[in-house]
Structure formats: C-alpha cells, structure tokens
Amino acid sequence: TPEVWVQVQMEATELSSFTVHCGFLGPGSISLVTVSWGGPDGAGGTKLAVLHPELGTRQWAPARQARWETQSSISLALEDSGASSPFANTTFCCKFASFPEGSWESCGSLPPSSDPGLSAPPTPVPILRAD
C-alpha cells in the first residue's frame, strides 16, 4: 500500500522559519502534490502550495519556496512573519496524486517540545483516500 510521510522542521538559525518535508512511498508516477495547512485538502485545510513534476511549482504566503527534493519527495519553506509562532501548533498535510494509485494524503505537525533544528519523526497520520 502506498504511504505518504510528513516531517515538519524548525530551522535552527531562524526560529521564524519552518520547512515541511513530504514524501511518497509506493509505485506509480506522481502527477501532482498539494500542501495544505489547518487540515487535509477539502476538509478545512488551506492550500499553500501545488507542485507538478513538469509544469512547475506554485506557493502562496506564508510559504516561501516549494521544491522537489527527489522524484518522490518535496519540501516547502515557510516564513512566519508574526511575533508569535502559529506554525508550532499547525497541522500540515501533503496530498500526492499518483497514477494509477489515486490520491494519498498524510498530515504532520511540529512536536510541542521541538528544539530548533529537530524535525518531527516521520510518523504520518494517514488519510488513506484513494480518490
């Protein structure tokens, strides 16, 4: 069964910077990735980035840069402009659309006691939707 993993990481040097890393474990080719925050795509979440393997990547504030790390993993850098840190308690979800498997989504967040530079363990909260 395909699986999606999500890691949320606070940058050690910039406490207002976070990076979301997501990956797809499974066969098939990825056709689109969407990253949302505040919940899963279509269930209260707001899309922050859309990545297509060949057409390009798009992101919207507070996301700074979306990029492909490998053919099956992506990263999204976020900049927290506020004084407080809303990202610390936020859920980030990554949805991978792949052919022929369908869509698979998992969510993750920064652990409450996270030290800067440490990442959340890659234990996804799977929402195994094969749309």
Epitope: K47, L55, G56, R58, W68
Partner: antibody
Framework: EVQLQQSGPELVKPGASVKISCKAS????????MNWVKQSHGKSLEWIGD????????NFNQKFKGKATLTIDKSSSTTYMELRSLTSEDSAVYYC???????WGQGTTLTVSS | DIVMTQSPSSLSVSAGEKVTMSCKSS????????????LAWYQQKPGQPPKLLIY???TRESGVPDRFTGSGSGTDFTLTISSVQAEDLALYYC?????????FGGGTKLEIK
C-alpha cells in the same frame, strides 16, 4: 471541459480604473487558481500575477505591483483583475490562464484613450 | 528575473519542411531534485490566446501532434516541427516555468511560403 470566459472589451480614459473578469467552469471550485497575463499589441507575453482561490493569496510580478489587484468570488467561480491609474501603456489584451497555463481565456482588450 | 531569448524572430518555410527554433534562458531551468526542466512552449495563432504545446521541455500536451518535439536542458532549448503544415502558421513562445516571475521569450513568428 475546462472553460475560462472573460469579460468584453473596455475603452477607458487615462487615470481611470477598470475591472475585468474571468469566469471558470469545468473543474473543482478550490482548483480555480488563476494567472493573469498581459500582451501589448505586437509584443510578447508578460505574467502579471496569480491568485489562490483557497485563501485569496496572491503573487505578483514586481512590475505590476501597485498597478494590478487580483480578487476572487468563490460563489460565482470568478476571478477579477483591477487595473488602476491607467495610461496608454496599459492598452493591451489581458488573458486569464489556469494555474500551469494549460487553459486560457479568450482575452479582454483594454484600450486607454482620451 | 530570468530572461528568455528566442531566435530567430521570424522564419518562412514551405509546407513539409522541418523547422527548428531556439530558446535560451539566462539561468538554468533544471530542477536538480527531480531532474526536470521547467520550460514550456506555446503556440499562438492570429486572434487567439496562446495554447500550451510542450511542458517540462519535452512533454507534449495532450492532443498536440507528434510533429512537435521539444528538447534541451539547463539553459538551451529547442522546438522542432518535423514537417510543417499550413495550420502551424503562428507565433511560438517559450516560457520560464521555473521561478517567478514566469517570463516569456520574445517569440518566433512562423510563416508559410
């Protein structure tokens, strides 16, 4: 079938503002990300900016910041671009295009003339 | 901003001939992570909006005839039409799909003799 239907031609006076629309149909409401592109007569294409329908977030080409404003009405699946302080340099055909430019509207001709 | 330079600015060929047009970018459009080039080609016929022909430098959009071929990597790209047809009369633009602002080349005008 995805369709992007733009509003009709506009003739406006210098210094005025204009709001042109692009109505999308044929795909999921939350996927109506929209780009706007300018094509001056006999010239190439210039990306103006894009809008995220989920939260109204926008990205702009620095050249068009302060000139263009992008908004969206989710209830009618319509994206709007307002251009202000118009000059003859703004006379052009303006296109809306889907997120990765795979679908385009038919274009709206804007003429700025006194 | 990434500058896209196309050449030639225009060319005139007879139906059935092979055509090659060039597009050069001021920065690499290759994404090292997935080894994909974010370069697109568009065709714009008179009085019509642009139409996506090629993306990822070499992937044909659905419904595009196989006489259209995109190639290249990094900063140098080529669009080839293997056997030009009368309906290919159009302007052809390349576009940086790698990073904002998503700049376009100046275009190559294809005329049929």
């Amino acid at each position: 079938e995805v369709q992007l239907q733009q509003s009709g031609p506009e003739l406006v006076k210098p210094g005025a503002s204009v709001k042109i629309s692009c109505k999308a149909s044929g795909y999921t409401l939350t996927d109506y990300y929209m780009n706007w592109v300018k094509q001056s007569h006999g010239k190439s294409l210039e990306w103006i900016g894009d809008i995220n329908p989920n939260n109204g977030g926008t990205n702009f080409n620095q050249k068009f910041k302060g000139k263009a404003t992008l908004t969206i009405d989710k209830s009618s699946s319509t994206t709007y671009m307002e251009l202000r302080s118009l000059t003859s340099e703004d006379s052009a055909v303006y296109y809306c295009a889907s997120l990765f430019f795979d679908y385009w509207g038919q274009g709206t001709t804007l003429t700025v003339s006194s | 901003d990434i500058v896209m330079t196309q050449s030639p600015s225009s060319l005139s060929v007879s139906a059935g001939e092979k055509v090659t047009m060039s597009c050069k970018s001021s920065q690499s459009l290759l994404n090292s992570g997935n080894q994909k080039n974010y370069l697109a080609w568009y065709q714009q016929k008179p009085g019509q909006p642009p139409k996506l022909l090629i993306y990822g430098a070499s992937t044909r959009e659905s419904g595009v005839p196989d006489r259209f071929t995109g190639s290249g990597s990094g900063t140098d790209f080529t669009l080839t039409i293997s056997s030009v047809q009368a309906e290919d009369l159009a302007l052809y633009y390349c576009q940086n799909a790698h990073s904002s602002p998503y700049t376009f080349g100046g275009g190559t005008k294809l005329e049929i003799k």
